[in-house]
Every structure is written in C-alpha cells, then in structure tokens.
C-alpha cells in the first residue's frame, strides 16, 4: 500500500483520510475528499510493474494454484481414508490457498485496467482479507505440518483418532485466529479514488491516519506473532529432523525417506525465502517509512514482495507431493492423464503375475494413507 493523504487529504500507501464521496460534473468528477499521491507512487501505479508484471504473476499463480490445490483438497477429503494430522494440515493449507486464489481473476483484471477497481468496496475488502489471511494461514499450517513431521520421526506411533482430533482442533483454532487478526482489513475502507490518475485503487492507497500508526503496529505485530515465531518453530523442527535422520540407520527405505524429507525442507525453505520473509519484512519497513517520513521509498519492492508471497499457492502442492503418498499418486496420474483406477488395475495384474509380496510395495492404494517420507 502507498500512503494517500487527504486534501483535506493526499495519498500514498501511499497516505489519506477516509470518507471520500464524489459526484460527476460534466467531464470530470468533483471529489469531497481528495487523495493525491506523490509522483513516484503515481509512476508505480501507472507503470508496467503493476499493470503488466503483477497480472502475469497472478495469472500463473491462478492457473497453477487453482487446479493443484483443488485436486489436493479433493484427494485429502475424498481419496484419503485415514485422516492423519499431516493430511488434516495439508487439507487446510489447500483450502486456504483456494480461498485466496479464487479471487485472483478480479485482482488480475484490476491490475490490467491500470489499478482501477470497479467491483465495489465489499469485494475489495474480501480480496485483501483473503490475500493476507492466506499468507498467515499458510505460515501457521506449514508450521503445524513441520512440527508434526518431526513428531512422527521422533515418535513413530500408529495413527490414532485422538491425534486427528487434536489436529482438527488446532486447525479450527488457526482459522479463528486468522479471522480475528484480519478483521481490521475487512473493516477499513480499502478503495480510494485518485483524481490525478482517474482510478479507484484497492488497498494500494490507504487513509493517512490509519496507516501512519495503526498499520505499522498491525503489520509489526503480525510479523512477530504470525511470522517470526512460527518461522522459528518451523526452523527448529527441521534442524532437529535433519539431526534425527542423520543419526538413523541407513537402509534403502530410510534413505528414500531422508531424500524426501530433504526435498520437503528445501521446498519449505524456498517458500520462506521467496514468499514469507520478503513480504513480512517489507510490510514492516514500508509502513515504518510512511509513519516516519510520510512516504515509502520501498513501495515498488513492497509491491513485488507481496506479489511473490502469492507464489506459496504454487509451492504448497510440492509440499503435498513430498508428504502425501496419495497426492503423489494422483498428481503423477493427473500429469500423465491416467486415472487411478487404471493404474490400480495394472498393479493388480502385475501382482498376480509375479505372485510376489514385494510387488505390493509399489501399490498406491487410494484407500490407505502413507504420510511417511
């Protein structure tokens, strides 16, 4: 966002004051509360970064994220019999991604049309609430999944209903927490008309009084509580997991597990480096600069960081792939345009031909869940 301050207000999140109504007079519009942005912010709002680069990235995220997370949710809900904690966390992760990604066509259209929001105040608030909600949900569910994966290695007990119930309880608590922490994003006026550019922005220009203090405090609190603390837990879980895997016996099966664990760790690390760290860092820096200087010199970086944060919806399916045997099979089959039933039939005939017990290790039954690496 830039700060938009009100003329009695001008803008740049760009800063400004709320309650701007307007009425048309001949060619132009007479505004009751005017938000004027600085030249740098205006160049960002009208430049190729926001009108070409962002829609391209969001289109990729939508095209990749919608089907992959949709399939993941379907697999976890309907093709996985035993709902292990990992499955529950991944199902929630996929749901969070879907709830964010479904609004992307509006976001893409908004940027393509020069950052002009024509879909009304309510839809803008929903889009922004879900946008940030997805990021913080992803961080928290990823933390739960990471801690759970470590727990499975330390404590390799069988599936229990109690563990699944605990995971469901934690998931509901996370959704409730995210709903509560994103309330300010739904309540605050997010759409603002910029007379100089003849556009109505959604979240890119926000009211001055709000931004100066409250937004900095808000995003700083979220960065500490919902990013840094979970990131520390995730990192700790993976460091301990690597130690455990190093010291464990090295048969062929555990070597496979170790490789998949490393792939998972690399994927989660990439997600933090690309999606979560830049966005949370720049949210704080951006709003700090507005609070202290009245304008943000990192606005373009902040825009890019927030855009890259949406890539988590494309990276999450790789997490499902390295954790869930079921998702792995469905993903492979979907990519090869084969049905699971066909693959099963092939495996059954293979098994009957070989009369070998070993062949069952290739089985990818969709009725059993293997959340091991």
């Amino acid at each position: 966002t830039i700060q938009g301050t009100n003329r009695s207000s001008k803008g740049r999140s760009l800063i400004g004051k709320v309650d701007g109504t307007s009425h048309v007079t001949g060619k132009g519009v007479t505004v009751e509360t005017v938000f004027s942005v600085d030249e740098f912010s205006a160049s960002v709002l009208t430049g190729k970064l926001t009108t070409v680069f962002l829609p391209i990235v969001y289109t990729i995220v939508f095209v990749v994220g919608l089907p992959s997370n949709g399939m993941a949710l379907w697999v976890f809900l309907f093709r996985t019999k035993k709902k292990h904690p990992a499955v529950i966390y991944m199902a929630n992760l996929a749901l969070a991604d879907l709830l964010s990604v479904i609004w992307f066509p509006l976001k893409i259209a908004y940027h393509i049309h020069g950052n002009n929001w024509i879909y009304g105040e309510a839809l803008c608030n929903v889009l922004i609430g879900f946008f940030y909600g997805n990021m913080y949900c992803s961080i928290l569910f990823m933390t739960c999944l990471s801690v759970q994966r470590y727990w499975v290695i330390v404590n390799p007990m069988g599936h229990s209903r109690k563990k699944a119930n605990i995971a469901i309880g934690i998931s509901l608590a996370i959704w409730l927490l995210i709903l509560l922490v994103t309330i300010p994003l739904y309540v605050v006026k997010q759409t603002i008309f910029i007379p100089a550019l003849n556009i109505t922005t959604c979240h890119d220009v926000l009211p001055e009084q709000l931004l100066v203090g409250d937004m900095f405090n808000y995003f700083l609190s979220l960065a500490i509580g919902v990013f840094l603390f979970p990131a520390f837990l995730t990192a700790s879980a993976y460091v301990l997991m690597i130690r455990m895997l190093r010291s464990s016996a090295m048969d062929e099966n555990s070597e496979k597990k170790r490789k998949r664990a490393i792939k998972l760790i690399v994927t989660v690390l990439a997600m933090y480096l690309i999606c979560f760290t830049p966005s949370n860092l720049l949210l704080v820096v951006h709003y700090f600069l507005i609070k202290s200087q009245g304008q943000s010199h990192v606005y373009a970086l902040y825009i890019v960081a927030l855009c890259l944060s949406t890539l988590n919806s494309c990276i999450d399916p790789f997490v499902y792939y390295f954790v869930s045997h079921d998702f792995r099979d469905h993903a492979k089959n979907a990519l090869l345009c084969r049905s699971v039933r066909t693959v099963k039939q092939m495996q059954v005939s293979l098994t009957s031909k070989k009369h070998s017990r070993k062949s069952s290790s290739y089985s990818s039954s969709s009725t059993t869940v293997k959340t091991s690496y």
Epitope: V29, S36, E39, Q295
Partner: antibody, heavy 119, light 106 residues
Amino acid sequence: QVQLQESGPGLVKPSETLSLTCTVSGFSLNSYGVIWIRQPPGKGLEWIGVIWGNGNTYYNPSLKSRVTISVDTSKNQFSLKLSSVTAADTAVYYCARWRGYKDYPFDYWGQGTLVTVSS
Amino acid sequence: EIVLTQSPATLSLSPGERATLSCKASQNIYKYLDWYQQKPGQAPRLLIYNTNSLHTGIPARFSGSGSGRDFTLTISSLEPEDFAVYYCLQHNSGWTFGGGTKVEIK
C-alpha cells in the same frame, strides 16, 4: 515558456456570479492542472479549488457550495465561477500551475486579477 | 485543518544580514512545506518546495530546513530585492498558507 494569464470583469455586483478565465501556454493540460487562489487586499492567501488535467476537481470546503472550476482543453483555458458573491469575495484572484501530485508545488503563477464586489 | 504559524510577523534587517524565518505546523506535515516570496503588486513566487528543494532560477542564498512541525527559511545574506513578504504553504493534508512574514529594511 510557461505562462498563465487570468482575465475577467474587475467589478461584480453582490449576489451575482464571478467568472474568471485562466489561459495557459507552455505546458500540456493532460499533464498539469491548476489551482485557484485568492488574496483579499492586505491579507493572506486562501486556496479556492483545484482542477486536474483530466477534469476532476476539488474545492475548498468553506467555498464548495458556490464554486465551479472547469477546463476547456481546446482553448487551453481553465475557468472559475463563484456564485452569490459578497464584499468578502473582493480579492486578487490567481491561478497557478500544479502537476497534480502530492510532492509537487505550485511552480508558476499568473499575475493575478483584482475583482471588486460592489453595487 | 492544519494551521501554519509564521514568526516573526515582521523582520527588520539590513542588506547583507542573515534572515531566519520560522513556520510551525499544528501537526506533522513531514517534508511537505513550500516557501513563496511576494512583492507588492506581484504574484507569489516559488522559492523552496518540499522543505529544502530549491526551485529553478532561485539564488543559492535561499535555503530551507526542518521536518515534521518546525520549518525554517534562511536567507544567508540579504540582497535589496529580497525585502518582501514570505509565505509558507503546507500540502500534506489539504493546502494551508501561513500568515506571512514581512522582511523589511531596517
């Protein structure tokens, strides 16, 4: 070079409408707008309203019920109309160029035109 | 509405002396303050914009400083043509002019 020139009647009767024109040259009306400012004799400066190059306007809340600012791009002119004038509206009226962005000042001004409201 | 208070109202100095004009805002306006010079019968002329940026063609003896609420215009060595009225203008939230400071010959 950049030039702004205010013109209009020097005398207006109370309750009538004051009409002024600001003719500009040396810059594009697509990129710049103007702000109207007035200065009562021996007093300070007060802004009246602003118009962007795209025709959007914003008026001083204390005057907005009486003010209309418009642009005629074909003539390179901005106009100011102030209705129901009183003696308190007697002032030198200036138009000044503005880029329309927060960090831009009013860099070029017209020489001003004195408008007296009297019967 | 933001109020700008200029002081002193009148500054009596001799040519060659240093002039320091003050402008105080009722709330934080960051760097968004400009200085204008006005001579009798003339339109105001922009000197300094955004606190300390010198406008094209303005002599280097004019300089601006400050941030937040307190701002200063300094004329390092007064020339005869510098005796005029100086206005500050804030454009962080709306537009407000200060009451002016008259710099007169002592």
